[in-house]
Amino acid sequence: KSSNEATNITPKHNMKAFLDELKAENIKKFLYNFTQIPHLAGTEQNFQLAKQIQSQWKEFGLDSVELAHYDVLLSYPNKTHPNYISIINEDGNEIFNTSLFEPPPPGYENVSDIVPPFSAFSPQGMPEGDLVYVNYARTEDFFKLERDMKINCSGKIVIARYGKVFRGNKVKNAQLAGAKGVILYSDPADYFAPGVKSYPDGWNLPGGGVQRGNILNLNGAGDPLTPGYPANEYAYRRGIAEAVGLPSIPVHPIGYYDAQKLLEKMGGSAPPDSSWRGSLKVPYNVGPGFTGNFSTQKVKMHIHSTNEVTRIYNVIGTLRGAVEPDRYVILGGHRDSWVFGGIDPQSGAAVVHEIVRSFGTLKKEGWRPRRTILFASWDAEEFGLLGSTEWAEENSRLLQERGVAYINADSSIEGNYTLRVDCTPLMYSLVHNLTKELKSPDEGFEGKSLYESWTKKSPSPEFSGMPRISKLGSGNDFEVFFQRLGIASGRARYTKNWETNKFSGYPLYHSVYETYELVEKFYDPMFKYHLTVAQVRGGMVFELANSIVLPFDCRDYAVVLRKYADKIYSISMKHPQEMKTYSVSFDSLFSAVKNFTEIASKFSERLQDFDKSNPIVLRMMNDQLMFLERAFIDPLGLPDRPFYRHVIYAPSSHNKYAGESFPGIYDALFDIESKVDPSKAWGEVKRQIYVAAFTVQAAAETLSEVA
């Protein structure tokens, strides 16, 4: 099908024209411009950048560009009372203190307003006590400690290494274990790739580098004081005691030089196995407390950060659709950074800027997309996806009726090995078809398609000859659109080789060393990977906004639903006796999946044959495609997580970053063998199967012939 038919325009204004207009050199210039000073949410610098982007998007040719502001709860260190951790002796004297700041990178020594490393939303406090090393502080790590090793974390300060799961889950787990403080650190095993030098000589984390980040457990709520509603001028705000997702114990992050000093003295139990050892030259003893000579020494935290209601600013740009202006395709990424944001977020923001420029160029030449494209520069993503969530709360009625798709645009790179895509199954075919048309930027794949290099380097575990596409989890601005509103969503970026680099994220993530130079010297000197990501993100937006029939394939949803049903059934079948005792059956779910598969197949046949020149029928078919994702939304939400409403996907309860399929059933089954009331627990499993089966069946019926 040709996108040109959409708005009856000249053939030169097609996808190729849009892609050809994207330039690596522009992305490079934009990245440089966005990374010279810090743009922390709630600061004047970030407000000024919002106004600059507003002005430039207008110049690029968008129809309108507005600032949308909200007053949300943010968190900052106390400028005169710094946060740190000490080792104290028996007299209470501080004999060792962790560093108060990261040594600035070369060329940035005189930059002001670099926020020191802190855990955003940590409460104030000065707890002191014995240390317990809890590995990654995952659910399974606390199971190992409490159940197998009989180590009690109650009243202890725990030290956990970053990686594997979202830091907020670590803190939640520590709280549930009774800890009175949490120290987070970056172990070189996870943040130092072998054979690579530390910054500024390479892309590895130096010993003084520290990962900042929020430690909330919002579960999709947005601003902690106004869950469900926008934090506008007349908002009713909860008291801090009723705020959503705030941690109850002090938390602070440190680098591995400081961690070495704490961990080298650890006594108590030896680590349970090698998976608990990092790369520092320390025993990785679990504790509690320090070894022999140092047993009278304790650890003390000094946390003085404050939570403050602060104004934030989204930039919302509109390119009105010529044929279906009431159908919205959204491209959004955040603008706020912890410090310079060399990768997160500005490598993404620079790509969005260039995509806007390219669309604007086409518009100035007389072209318009078929559907409206909205461009967003979100604020306060780092503080809990606040800007995007507040805007979506404010515009939820419009979005649920008009939202076709949301494409996320945070960091364009987390490596330079191959493409990484997470998206709704509805977009699988769109992504496959698009990447087949794009050139691979990879060495050794000259003249080959992006699809080919991607498939070779990151093959699908299920389907040979196809690339891996992952489930959407959370930890980024698509969350509200996908998990709460049920708008088809996707994200794409260039990533590392997960086989050879098992560190978590990229080493300099959320540190002061995430600079323009990091990208320009070590990750993407030619900006060819950035350009490829711009082509993927921009190409997806172009097709979603311009194709006559929406580029969604509902048959791909049928395939994954069967896979997810098989998976959850096999998890349940680990308890055959209980399934028999409590009459647990998955028949309804498998039946619903079978129905969905058949109806989706028939819908796809009709989609090939219908009269596309009939605008009413075209709109009807497109609406069925648009509303399919919406049909997976349960208005009541998941148990204890009312803003996670998607029945097929939710962020894992144990790791916000990861997506879980049939999350309601999964959570009901999780650790079911330890539940005190098995009858009640298995009753909840049955209820969740019922909800899932009903939802799949109901979604299938939205694809049936309307009359």
């Epitope: 060792f96 203190n97 003084g208 591995y256 030259k281 025993p283």
Partner: antibody
Framework: QVQLVQSGAEVKKPGASVKLSCKAS????????INWVRQTPEQGLEWMGG????????NYNENFKGRVTMTRDTSSSTAYMELSRLRSDDTAVYYC?????????????WGQGTTVTVSS | DVVMTQSPLSLPVTLGEPASISCRSS???????????LHWYQQKPGQSPRLLIY???NRFSGVPDRFSGSGSGTDFTLKISRVEAEDVGVYFC?????????FGQGTKLEIK
Amino acid sequence: QVQLVQSGAEVKKPGASVKLSCKASGYTFTYFDINWVRQTPEQGLEWMGGISPGDGNTNYNENFKGRVTMTRDTSSSTAYMELSRLRSDDTAVYYCARDGNFPYYALTNWGQGTTVTVSS
Amino acid sequence: DVVMTQSPLSLPVTLGEPASISCRSSQSLVYSNGNTYLHWYQQKPGQSPRLLIYKVSNRFSGVPDRFSGSGSGTDFTLKISRVEAEDVGVYFCSQSTHVPYTFGQGTKLEIK
């Protein structure tokens, strides 16, 4: 760049004490342990011990315990090593060396050495 | 204490030819985290020792690639692929896995 500058040569009588200094620059002093290594033609290189400038924690070689004391002054980024009850076989070149911490855990930077002569 | 034994103690080499020094420890140098903290130092006449290779096989910054290290457990080797005049000096192996840290007796490399 990292530099360790040691104090000048010393001549001491048996039974006396000697206190050597090692001034560090070009890096964050409290992050890296300072070790002391001596070199004699007879014994070769001998590790005497180390000090953690951050907390002052020391780790001595048993062969020198009771005779060696390592201290530091964080305000001047200087480490000190005092050796008491000197004997003629303590005549040696004494080096301070910075432990490179992760990923090295080796002595990545050495001072120029201080010659100590013990003679009656 | 861990005893480090080097051989040979003296190594005359022709310029441009390879050289190899062996180092054996009295016990395993594998630390509990799986790393082996065996290092090689070079000491040129009248100078302080200088780190050459750390953790068995990793060249320290600025060290030419003609130097390489290998080995595991208790047996280790330093190789120079093509000896140059500036390589003259004494080479020490050392371990920092166990306290106290210990050094080999040194191998004196000289030009034939």
